[in-house]
């Protein structure tokens, strides 16, 4: 057999025995001649250096580059590969020789009284016990001890090969201290040398430090670092630590094996580094290295040592946070400190507790920010050891995209009498206030919804070509008043008004308000009618449980068939876009109402009376009249708003006050409610009567006591009452100083 790569024009050495395998008997002489084309050498089993005394290699007498190998009286141990090769090349010819020695069927290693086999306990691994045979076809079994077990080749994972040895899954013999091969020849047993079984591993899966990061201490505290190495079974570990102050007096290192669950394929080692009282010089990188000989793994962590406990705010701590309504707001408390501080949040001085809308921890989180969340938030950091406190104020500004108040009305589709002057209003609430409110318009017929046009709830008017109000050609003459600012419902609002000089044309008007965080718009249907006219008696806005009459007045010579309807709830989304369409063209959504007809010399008056008006009575009321000549129907729509009854409340408190004799006292008591409450004043629970020194103004809202006297001292009560109840506030007025004596005395 030949091995190696061919060199240029060099043939393989030729052996005198032209076989791959030669079998000879023990005690006979083995002689093989090798011829080649350049200097040759021989290699034989159990000897790589050529110092074996029994083996003789001689130059051939009959030619150059020829060597004969001779071994007289061969023994079983001479079994193996004999190789003739050219010096300095890989070119060689090999013959495998079996020396059949039935008294010694196994080839013994020259140097070993016993061998060593290394195994791992992995179920998938096999191990080869190198008990080579001097006879190729022996029946060989493997004996393991203790306890004694015998393994026989099974044609699968257990096998014996005379050139290789005995192959067996390593876990089968991992319990054993030693193994040997045994051959049976003619009922006689022959054993190989003993092999010591060494179960080894070397793999380090990982090295984990605990704590793994963010380790902070102050001078004098104890540092404990645990380093855990996870390895495969039968691994030994050397631990080594690197740390800043190597000459530490109070350093303690403890290494130990950790117990793992039985059946675990893993082993754990723990090394614990303890420094009893750290100093500043102990600050730095701590590295734990685990070494198994064939592998090293390490892990590091940084330990920070502070001179003493402290707390401070980090440079990234914000002072102003801006957000838009509905957003999630996160305000992190950025701090430097050891140990970590206790964190408490306050809003306008009141402690914040976590709930489903707000989380007050390291990060103050407001889930869905609203206007009422605007304010100053104070975060107070307290060092748990030194009790040192640091506070920082964060101003939260919540922006509101423009909201137009009138949009909340049910359906602003009032009709306007031809030729009249009308004012349209957009009341805008926005934070910051809108930087502009613009008005646009469009003719009603250009915008009336055709069936083919798609309409959505979000855009009920399919109008594309909005025109600026400066361009009022073909429309009504318009004037936009300067924006006004008003405090409405406790909020600063911007009021934009558009004055239509003469209502000549039906149109749609749109106001659009824009601020830094968004925009809002309102579309107003301005339907002009020459038809009937609606008035409300006695009030424009009744309160619930009051009575109200809707009067529809029409010229009797022009109109007939006056009828009252109420606009029903519109089925969405089909009719949403039809609001600007004259209501007369769409009677499907109208409910006919009972009414009473009166006449005078020129007009018919149809009166629809609502007794004890309720919130359900709110909505759009339609008066329909028919032209006597053309039979064309004319509609007028009026929106009725019914104010909710609200029990009296008094805004603001009366303050206790001390006044000197002869001075004046002025206090006010502002009450709200619907119906509006009556305000009364009491002194020491008796009705306060006006006289020259006691003045009540503005519906008793303001009380003035001029040139106070000692007898004006007492408990003053402001009481606001309506049919829904009373509300009251009290204050004690103290009058100081001596009463001047009068001449009468």
């Amino acid at each position: 057999a030949s091995v190696g790569l061919p060199s240029v024009s060099l043939d393989l050495p030729r052996l005198s025995i032209q076989k791959d395998i030669l079998t000879i008997k023990a005690n006979t002489t083995l002689q093989i001649t090798c011829r080649g084309q350049r200097d040759l050498d021989w290699l034989w089993p159990n000897n790589q250096s050529g110092s074996e005394q029994r083996v003789e290699v001689t130059e051939c007498s009959d030619g150059l580059f020829c060597k004969t190998l001779t071994i007289p009286k061969v023994i079983g141990n001479d079994t193996g590969a004999y190789k003739c090769f050219y010096r300095e090349t890989d070119l060689a010819s090999v013959i495998y020789v079996y020396v059949q020695d039935y008294r010694s069927p196994f080839i013994a290693s020259v140097s070993d009284q016993h061998g060593v086999v290394y195994i791992t306990e992995n179920k998938n691994k096999t191990v080869v016990i190198p008990c080579l045979g001097s006879i190729s076809n022996l029946n060989v079994s493997l004996c393991a001890r203790y306890p004694e077990k015998r393994f026989v080749p099974d044609g699968n994972r257990i096998s014996w090969d005379s050139k290789k040895g005995f192959t067996i899954p390593s876990y089968m013999i991992s319990y054993a201290g030693m193994v040997f091969c045994e051959a049976k020849i003619n009922d006689e047993s022959y054993q190989s040398i003993m092999y010591i079984v060494v179960v080894v591993g070397y793999r380090i899966y990982d090295v984990v430090l605990s704590p793994s990061h963010g380790i902070e201490l102050s001078v004098g505290e104890k540092l404990v670092l645990n380093c855990t190495a996870r390895t495969e079974l039968n691994v030994g570990i050397d631990f080594n630590w690197e740390y800043p102050s190597s000459k530490h007096q109070h350093k303690k290192l403890v290494n130990r094996d950790l117990k793992t669950q039985s059946g675990s394929e893993m082993k754990k080692f723990l090394s614990t580094l303890t420094i009893d009282g750290v100093t500043r010089s102990d600050q730095g990188l701590y590295t734990c290295a685990a070494s198994s000989g064939l592998m090293t793994k390490k892990n590091s962590t940084f330990v920070r040592v502070h001179e003493k406990p402290f707390v401070a705010f980090g440079s990234g701590m914000e002072s102003l946070v801006e957000a838009t309504v509905g957003e999630r707001v996160r305000i992190p408390a950025k701090y430097l400190g050891y140990p970590p501080p206790e964190i408490k949040w306050y809003k306008n001085g009141i402690p914040l507790e976590s709930n489903h809308t707000i989380k007050a921890g390291h990060v103050l989180t407001i889930m869905e920010v609203s206007e009422r969340d605007t304010g100053n938030y104070t975060v107070i950091l307290t060092n748990p050891i030194s009790k040192e406190k640091q506070s920082h104020v964060v101003s939260l500004v919540v922006y509101v995209p423009p909201q137009i108040g009138e949009k909340s009305l049910i359906s602003p589709v009032d009709s306007y009498q031809y030729g009249t002057t009308q004012t349209l209003t957009c009341t805008v609430y926005a934070i910051p206030p809108p930087h502009h409110i613009h008005w646009y318009w469009q003719l009603e017929e250009e915008c009336a919804n055709e069936p083919s046009q798609a309409v959505s709830v979000t855009n009920p008017y399919p109008c594309e070509e909005w025109r600026s109000v400066e361009d009022f050609q073909g429309g009504n003459k318009i004037e936009v008043n300067k924006n006004q600012f008003a405090l409405i419902e406790g909020k600063n609002k911007t009021v934009s008004t558009l004055v239509i000089q003469a209502a000549n044309v039906s149109a749609l008007y749109k106001c659009e308000a824009v601020n830094k965080v968004g925009r809002g718009e309102r579309v107003i249907s301005f339907h002009v009618t020459r038809g009937p006219e609606i008035t409300l008696q006695p009030d424009m806005q009744p309160t619930e449980q009051e009575s109200v009459s809707l009067w529809c007045t029409a010229d009797r010579s022009t109109f007939e068939n006056l009828t009252w309807y109420k606009l029903g709830p519109q089925p969405l989304p089909i009719h949403v876009g039809e609001l600007p369409t004259p209501v007369c063209k769409n009677l499907d959504t109208l409910w006919k109402l009972n009414a009473t007809m009166f006449s005078n010399s020129t007009n018919d008056i149809l009166i629809m009376e609502l007794k004890n008006a309720s919130l359900q009575d709110q909505g759009d009321y339609v008066c329909l009249a028919q032209d006597r000549k053309t039979k064309k129907r004319h509609c007028v729509v009026r929106q009725l708003t019914v104010l909710e009854r609200v029990a009296p409340t008094i805004t603001g408190n009366l303050e206790n006050q001390t006044t000197s004799i002869g001075e004046s006292i002025e206090v006010s008591c502002t009450a709200s409610g619907n119906p509006p409450p009556q305000i009364m004043w009491f002194k020491d629970n008796e009705t306060l009567v006006e006289d020259s020194g006691i003045v009540l103004k503005d519906g008793n809202r303001n009380l003035t006591i001029r040139r106070v006297r000692k007898e004006d001292e007492g408990l003053y009560t402001c009481q606001a009452c309506s049919v829904l109840g009373c509300a009251k506030v009290e204050a004690f007025f103290i009058i100081e100083g001596a009463q001047e004596k009068t001449n009468l005395e």
């Epitope: 086999v117 290394y118 195994i119 791992t120 992995n122 998938n124 691994k125 096999t126 191990v127 390593s170 080894v200 591993g201 070397y202 793999r203 380090i204 030994g236 050397d238 080594n240 690197e242 590295t287 290295a289 070494s291 198994s292 000989g293 064939l294 592998m295 090293t296 793994k297 390490k298």
Partner: antibody
């Protein structure tokens, strides 16, 4: 930076002895396993021996077992290979190498050992 | 001497990709994800270019990549350059607590 500087190579007769040294710098020598790898002239690399950081665990290739001894001195940041009963087939360039998560993440420059009569 | 089997030589033109295989048994390459690859220029010490089958140490070009399937590991050099001409060796741990190297592959850039 990591440096491994070798010394101790030379010519020796078959059966003779030689001691190779490897001086380490640029890393914490006492934390790492170390090994020796050799390369016969014109041939491939062959692993020779490994030693754990505190010398608790030592491994050898079968071809050198019983003849070579690996050792280290962490105080001197040095690794050694004592080679006895040298044979012609031990002729090679010997490299010391650091054992990281793999067998040789940094290598020395190599030193030639020639065994010849 | 048992070694992992590598092709004796592989060649490619500049810019091409080449792959070197390294075949062992389930006792070495197949058994562990601990195959490494080394580059050795003539007269120089080997240099680690891939560890743990496919991890590239910092400073090694991303043109070198490693993979493994069964008992065979592979090193791929993409965008071949003149400086890639060198010997390449694989190695693996074995179940016998030893380390095996491949026979080496000479890479020639045409």
């Amino acid at each position: 930076q990591v440096q491994l500087v070798q010394s101790g190579g030379g010519l020796v007769k078959p059966g003779g002895s030689l001691r190779l040294s490897c001086a380490a710098s640029g890393f914490t020598f006492s934390s790492y396993s170390m090994n020796w790898v050799r390369q016969a002239p014109g041939k491939g690399l062959e692993w020779v021996s490994s030693i754990s950081s505190s010398s608790s665990y030592i491994y050898y290739a079968d071809s050198v077992k019983g003849r070579f001894t690996i050792s280290r001195d962490n105080a001197k940041n040095s690794l050694y290979l004592q080679m006895n009963s040298l044979r012609a087939e031990d002729t090679a360039v010997y490299y010391c190498a650091r054992v990281g998560a793999t067998m040789g993440d940094y290598w020395g420059q190599g030193t030639l050992v020639t065994v010849s009569s | 001497l048992p070694v992992l089997t590598q092709p004796a030589s592989v060649s490619g033109s500049p810019g091409q990709s080449i792959t070197i295989s390294c075949t062992g048994t389930d006792s070495d390459v197949g058994g562990y994800n601990y195959v490494s690859w080394y580059q050795q220029h003539p007269g120089k010490a080997p240099k680690l270019i891939i560890s743990d089958v496919s991890n590239r140490p910092s400073g090694v070009s991303n043109r070198f990549s490693g993979s493994k399937s069964g008992n065979t590991a592979s090193l791929t050099i993409s965008g071949l350059q003149a400086d890639d001409e060198a010997d390449y060796y694989c190695n693996s741990y074995t179940v016998h607590a030893t380390v095996l190297f491949g026979g080496g592959t000479k890479v020639t850039v045409l």
